[in-house]
Structures are given as C-alpha cells and as structure tokens.
C-alpha cells in the first residue's frame, strides 16, 4: 500500500538532510586533515 503524500515528503526531506550532514562531516574532516598537514609542514 502506498504511503500518504505527507510521509513521502518527509522521507525525501530526511534523505536530503542525511546527505547534507554527510557532506558537512566530510568537509570538516578535510579541514582537520589540512590543519594537520599544515602543522607538519610548519615544523
């Protein structure tokens, strides 16, 4: 049986949210790696 439209809307909102959180975490990790690299180069 099909889900009601409201629940469909939210499931796709949640998927988008998950993707955005993953992207933000990836960027944060990249920034952290860059800082570590700069510390090593700076020494």
């Amino acid at each position: 049986s099909e889900e009601p439209p409201i629940s469909l809307d939210l499931t796709f909102h949640l998927l988008r949210e998950v993707l955005e959180m993953a992207r933000a975490e990836q960027l944060a990790q990249q920034a952290h790696s860059n800082r570590k690299l700069m510390e090593i180069i700076g020494k």
Partner: antibody, heavy 115, light 112 residues
Framework: EVQLVESGGGLVQPGGSLRLSCAAS????????MSWVRQAPGKGLEWVAN????????YYVDSVKGRFTISRDNAKNSLYLQMNSLRAEDTAVYYC??????WGWGQGTLVTVSS | DIVMTHSPLSLPVTPGDPASISCRSS???????????LDWYLQKPGQSPQLLIY???NRASGVPDRFSGSGSGTDFTLKFIRVEAEDVGVYYC?????????FGQGTKLEIK
C-alpha cells in the same frame, strides 16, 4: 559546537498556557528542520512536532493538534512551542532537537501541569 | 500510527560481552528508495538522548564502531560487538517513515 538550550518550562494549572523557547547555535539554524520531543517523568520518548526550514510545513502528534503550535524565527536562531489548553498528561521534559533525524538535543525544560 | 516494540525491555550484560537489542515495527519501514526509516537513540542516565544509528544501519558522527544497526522491513537489531560500562542507559528505536514519528518503549541496558 552545536548547542540547543530550551527555556520557558514551569508549573502551570490545567487549561493554562506556556511558551517554550529553544536557542540554537553552532550550526546554520535556517538550513535545518527542527523538532520537539517530550518525555513524561519516568517514561519513554514521545515525538511532538517538527517544522520545516522556512516554516511552510509542520507536523504534530494527534494528542497535541489544535493545542500546540510550533514556530521558528530564523533571524534569532530560535525555535518555539506555544502550548495552550494544557492537560496533566502534558507534564514532561520537553527537548528541542536539530533535524528530522534528531541529530542533536538540548538539555530539556520541565513542564508541570498541576492544580 | 506505526507501533514500535522493543525486546528485551531489560538487558543485563557483562562488560566485554556482545549483546543485541531488537525492535519490531507494526508495518514495513522499507521505503521505495531502498532505505529503512529506522533510527536508534541512547539516553544515558541523567542525560538527554543522542542519535546512534540513522536509516537503519548508518552510525552517527562520533559513535564507536562497536555499535551496529541491521535489519529491514519490520525487524531491526542494534548490536554491540562488546559492551562497555559507559554503554549503560535506555536505548530507543524510532520510525521516521511517516508522521507522527513513534518511538519504542525502550530497552534498559545495565551492567551485571
């Protein structure tokens, strides 16, 4: 660091009103759905309501529909829950949370409905 | 509304041992996108809840890899490779397939 700080709880008589607030920081508030979840003393968690980034959509559990209103002010990084016609069964700690998946939670504010 | 049911409701464990918690939903949480709309939360004593697992099997940021989520449709499991003393608290599953989102009644994990 993500921070959510609830306020506005307290003791109120049945039939009374309260407005809860949640001050958000450490993330882009206007990019996120926001939610309220409550927990009656010694009981489990109950999802109450959520609201879209631009306030164009909101959803409620049946037991609070027509009595509670979720709202937000993106300019102030704040989430609100206006609670009217309060009942004894609304007594709970109310948590605000970031997102649909409830990524982060505040410390909660206690609402006690009693005569 | 979708009803979520935990088992067991209480789980005494010995540190270092594996453990698992089950959660069953009254209807399938498998969406047409292929994702299961099931999250797991932990509420440690005296603290606010925290997200552990989202969409059935994805660990939230900072969650140790000794936790894992599995299952599909109506039957889900939260597994601990080895329980540590800091894992005590109440574990809740929540369905996010449709509003109102609903939580299970919780499983209390305690150390023997």
């Amino acid at each position: 660091e993500v921070q959510l700080v609830e306020s506005g709880g307290g003791l109120v008589q049945p039939g009374g009103s309260l407005r809860l607030s949640c001050a958000a920081s450490g993330f882009t508030f206007s990019d996120n759905w926001m939610s309220w979840v409550r927990q009656a003393p010694g009981k489990g968690l109950e999802w109450v309501a959520n609201i879209k980034q631009d306030s164009s959509e909101n959803y409620y559990v049946d037991s609070v529909k027509g009595r509670f209103t979720i709202s937000r002010d993106n300019a102030k990084n704040s989430l609100y829950l206006q609670m009217n016609s309060l009942r004894a069964e609304d007594t709970a700690v109310y948590y605000c949370s970031r997102g649909l998946a409830l990524w982060g939670w505040g410390q909660g504010t206690l609402v006690t409905v009693s005569s | 509304d979708i009803v979520m049911t935990h088992s067991p409701l209480s789980l005494p464990v010995t540190p270092g041992d594996p453990a698992s918690i089950s959660c069953r939903s009254s209807q399938s949480l498998l969406h047409s996108t292929g994702y299961n709309y099931l999250d797991w939360y932990l509420q440690k004593p005296g603290q606010s809840p925290q997200l552990l697992i989202y969409l059935g099997s994805n660990r939230a940021s900072g969650v140790p890899d000794r936790f894992s989520g599995s299952g599909s449709g109506t039957d889900f499991t939260l597994k601990f490779i080895r329980v540590e003393a800091e894992d005590v608290g109440v574990y809740y599953c929540m369905q996010a397939l449709q509003t109102p989102y609903t939580f299970g009644q919780g499983t209390k994990l305690e150390i023997k």
